[in-house]
Interface confidence: medium
């Protein structure tokens, strides 16, 4: 693999604990420097598998919101404007990295978690399968 | 509003820092316990508004590797299996957390940082601008 | 106890923008709860405008607004903004900042916007 | 977007009396978390909201324990026990947990 030099002004790390508990800057850097500050856009109303977000809040979690998308219909919504029962609305669902407060209700210390959280959804073809 | 008490175990925090910087334990809690092991489902191949999966591999982030989601087609699939231009394949976007090692190569000491990436695709009606 | 102070009443033309500021007196939470912004019309009810988490800078507005309004906020002074632009004399209005764990916990004293010719 | 509706528009009481307020929705506030984001506002005339309740049931600290909240689904209750010449003014039923949030019209409190 690539080897990089350590950068001689890291911070100490305590051998105990290293890496496992690592200091992380809360000012949040941000690479979407292109996107469109408009980012609530309508897919949700306008996709052929419609989907509704719901609220997931928890406190303790660090984005404490996240916005969980559950589509609307089993099938898609045709040309016609009617749900198509030969497609299949599905979620695209996506792992995701949390800071979660441990000890509980501490301002200043994290533990990584991942979860998954439906983004959207997409209208597939079923998979048929034939009865012998 | 609702006050629950700061708990007494917690880490001091540094005031000129606080509570920009935290400490992360990185021992990963991973509560998707109940999920479907085939999460790298067939949806890219089987949608109506089909993707390719890019590898987005940076040594400086953890995660280290991002899947992003690329839409084959300008339009989505119709039944004859054909690309159909009256509606359109769009990319379904989430913003996520990911760690950026700072300063550069240092083992312990992160920042947060978070970037936009695409899921998956979804085949939406097109928005019509109707000249005067 | 949270204090949410928000900057003082404006009078604007229509076709003008106006730009409200909500500072947060809470700097233990703040940079990771989500801000909210709602409007109340003269004698009548509340309307969502729009949601930013600080930090991530991240934001929701409602449909109504999407195109208007802009939410931005400064993390080192804890203070949230709510640009609308476009204004007409339907957004007269208290526009309010409001925040807290599961929904608006926590309200600034209002920002009354008078749109008048 | 959800349709809250509230009932009454307007709710004469007698100091020491009961009174109670109804909400629904037009879809169920169940989130996908198994949490109901169902809160209710009281606005004292010429003040700034205040939340009294959230996820249907939790008073909010400060909140006096005469108000209570309930319901399930899509019908929600906000009931004061004894009414108190403090509580005069307008309570909102509003939900957060369908993007977007969408208020109740609510409803005026006032002593009879």
């Known amino acids: 693999g690539i080897t990089i030099p350590r950068n001689p002004g890291c911070p100490n790390s305590e051998d105990k604990n290293f890496p496992r508990t690592v200091m992380v800057n809360l000012n949040i850097h941000n690479r979407n420097t292109n996107t469109n500050p408009k980012r609530s856009s309508d897919y949700y109303n306008r996709s052929t598998s419609p989907w509704n977000l719901h609220r997931n809040e928890d406190p303790e979690r660090y984005p404490s919101v996240i916005w969980e998308a559950k589509c609307r219909h089993l099938g898609c919504i045709n040309a016609d404007g009617n749900v198509d029962y030969h497609m299949n609305s599905v979620p695209i669902q996506q792992e995701i990295l949390v800071l979660r407060r441990e000890p509980p209700h501490c301002p200043n210390s994290f533990r990584l978690e991942k979860i998954l959280v439906s983004v959207g959804c997409t209208c597939v073809t079923p998979i048929v399968h034939h009865v012998a | 509003g609702i006050t629950i008490p700061r708990n007494p175990g917690c880490p001091n925090s540094e005031d000129k820092n606080f509570p920009r910087t935290v400490m992360v334990n990185l021992n990963i809690h991973n509560r998707n316990t109940n999920t479907n092991p085939k999460r790298s489902s067939d949806y890219y191949n089987r949608s109506t508004s089909p993707w390719n999966l890019h590898r987005n591999e940076d040594p400086e982030r953890y995660p280290s590797v991002i899947w992003e989601a690329k839409c084959r087609h300008l339009g989505c699939i119709n039944a004859d299996g054909n690309v159909d231009y009256h509606m359109n394949s769009v990319p379904i976007q989430q913003e996520i957390l990911v760690l950026r090692r700072e300063p550069p190569h240092c083992p312990n000491s992160f920042r947060l940082e978070k970037i936009l990436v695409s899921v998956g695709c979804t085949c939406v009606t097109p928005i019509v601008h109707h000249v005067a | 106890q949270v204090q949410l102070v928000q900057s003082g009443a404006e009078v604007k033309k229509p076709g003008s923008s106006v730009k409200v500021s909500c500072k947060d007196s809470?700097?233990?939470?703040?940079?990771?709860?989500?801000m909210s912004w709602v409007r109340q019309a003269p004698g009548q009810g509340l309307e969502w405008i729009g949601d930013?988490?600080?930090?991530?800078?991240?934001?929701f507005y409602g449909e109504k607004f999407e195109d208007r309004v802009t939410l931005t906020a400064d993390t080192s002074t804890n203070t949230a903004y709510m640009e609308l632009s476009s204004l007409r004399s339907e957004d007269t209005a208290v526009y309010y900042c409001?925040?807290?764990?599961?929904?608006?916990?926590?309200w600034g004293q209002g920002t009354l916007v008078t749109v008048s010719a | 977007d959800v349709v809250m509706t509230q009932s009454p528009l307007s709710l004469p009481v007698t100091l020491g009396q009961p009174a109670s307020i109804s909400c629904k929705s037009s879809q169920s506030l169940l989130g996908s978390d198994g949490k109901t984001y169902l809160n209710w506002l009281q606005q004292r005339p010429g003040q700034s909201p205040r939340r009294l309740i959230y996820?249907?049931?939790k008073l909010d600290s400060g909140v006096p324990d005469r108000f209570s909240g309930s319901g399930s689904g899509t019908d929600f209750t906000l009931k004061i026990s004894r009414v108190e010449a403090e509580d005069v003014g307008v309570y909102y039923c509003w939900q957060v947990t369908h993007f977007p949030y969408t208020f109740g019209g609510g409803t005026k409190l006032e002593i009879k």
């Open positions: 809470d700097s233990t939470f703040s940079p990771i709860v989500y």
């Open positions: 409001a925040r807290g764990d599961y929904g608006f916990a926590y």
């Open positions: 930013i988490l600080p930090s991530l800078g991240r934001i």
């Open positions: 996820l249907v049931s």
